[in-house]
Interface confidence: low
């Protein structure tokens, strides 16, 4: 398909015009053709910021213990999350772990397991703002 950008008709090679001296926009990367950018291929590669990269960043494939929260677009990487019943702390690169099945004796669950955190338990007598 022809892209119209800056009132320039560009043919089937799908060049996005980028004036010399500008970065390529998100969703594209620097072309070998001076003053031009190549679009990333949906589901294959992406760039999420203005850039001068030789190639789009490869889309991440979710691991076997994860599911896809949102697919890879030309401007955003695949978002993966742990499958139901498992979690991984936000800043951790570890494998998804099984959620705890319940709270220890004398404690009550105040937060369910999410893909990003285990269940949360508090002592029955503690007033932490949750309605228990």
């Amino acid at each position: 398909a022809t892209i119209k950008l800056h009132d320039q008709s560009i043919g089937t090679q799908q060049w996005e015009h980028s004036p010399l001296g500008e970065l390529c926009p998100p969703g594209s990367h620097r072309s070998e053709r001076p003053g031009a950018c190549n679009r990333c291929t949906e589901g294959v590669g992406y760039t999420n910021a203005s850039n001068n990269l030789f190639a789009c960043l490869p889309c991440t494939a979710c691991k076997s213990d994860e599911e896809e929260r949102s697919p890879c677009t030309t401007t955003r990487n695949t978002a993966c999350q742990c499958k139901p019943g498992t979690f991984r702390n936000d800043n951790s690169a570890e494998m998804c772990r099984k959620c705890s099945t319940g709270c220890p004796r004398g404690m009550v669950k105040v937060k369910d397991c999410t893909p990003w955190s285990d269940i949360e338990c508090v002592h029955k007598e503690s007033g932490n703002g949750h309605n228990i």
Epitope: L20, G21, L23, R30, S31, R33, P34, G35, N52
Partner: antibody
Framework: QVQLQESGPGLVKPSETLSLTCTVS????????WSWVRQSPGKGLEWIGS???????NYNPSLKSRVTMTIDKSKKQFPLKIDSVTAADTAMYYC??????????WGQGTLVTVSS | SYVLTQPPSASGTPGQRVTISCAGS????????VNWYQQLPATAPKLLIY???QRPSGVPDRFSGSKSGTSASLAISGLQSEDEADYYC???????????FGGGTKLTVLG
């Protein structure tokens, strides 16, 4: 019009460090990759390495252990250092701007002689 | 030794057509685009042809480039005395992860 200017000492002693700087004018340093290329007297061109605006480098494998490239966006400069030089490093050194995989603008070059 | 192979010299008379070859392999020319640079005596290289066959603005259409398989060629038609220079081919080499050049071809315009 983009202009590149190489600067640095023209004479370096063997085993010392060669230090050159490329200064960019007439354009942004943040939008491109930048390269160093050298040419020994009477010989062809040899790529030394490239650096992008974020400081990510890519070096010629044959020189990698001795080469360091950095970028200073505020000064619009990208320096080159080559350690432990020998007479074989005597060459004309060029800096160049990369557009994708094309070096479209080159500096005029600076001759570096390695001699005691 | 250079990764890309060029003839060391070429010559022609004014008005003639001259071709300079550049031979590589599947890891460089075979999978990447080729650029050609002209280096006039005592000057820096100048981009002459990019992406196999594209001319930057200001380069006369007497200069043309082509690529086939693992080889590339630069053709100069209507040879002029000011074309006397060294010509280099260059491309990316996937196995080396960097730029590679040919050894250069010295073009002499006779007469």
């Amino acid at each position: 019009q983009v202009q590149l200017q190489e600067s640095g000492p023209g004479l370096v002693k063997p085993s010392e460090t060669l230090s050159l700087t490329c200064t960019v004018s007439g354009g942004s340093i943040s939008d491109y990759y930048w390269s160093w290329v050298r040419q020994s007297p009477g010989k062809g061109l040899e790529w030394i390495g490239s650096i992008d605006y974020a400081g990510s480098t890519n070096y010629n494998p044959s020189l990698k252990s001795r080469v360091t490239m950095t970028i200073d966006k505020s000064k619009k400069q990208f320096p080159l250092k080559i350690d432990s030089v020998t007479a074989a490093d005597t060459a004309m050194y060029y800096c160049a701007r990369q557009l994708g995989r094309i070096s479209d603008y080159w500096g005029q070059g600076t001759l570096v002689t390695v001699s005691s | 030794s250079y990764v890309l192979t060029q003839p060391p010299s070429a010559s022609g008379t004014p008005g003639q057509r001259v071709t300079i070859s550049c031979a590589g392999s599947s890891s460089n020319i075979g999978g990447n685009t080729v650029n050609w640079y002209q280096q006039l005596p005592a000057t820096a290289p100048k981009l002459l042809i990019y992406s196999n066959n594209q001319r930057p603005s200001g380069v006369p259409d007497r200069f043309s480039g082509s690529k086939s398989g693992t080889s590339a060629s630069l053709a100069i038609s209507g040879l002029q005395s000011e074309d006397e220079a060294d010509y280099y081919c260059a491309t990316w080499d996937d196995s080396r992860g960097g730029w590679v050049f040919g050894g250069g071809t010295k073009l002499t315009v006779l007469g």
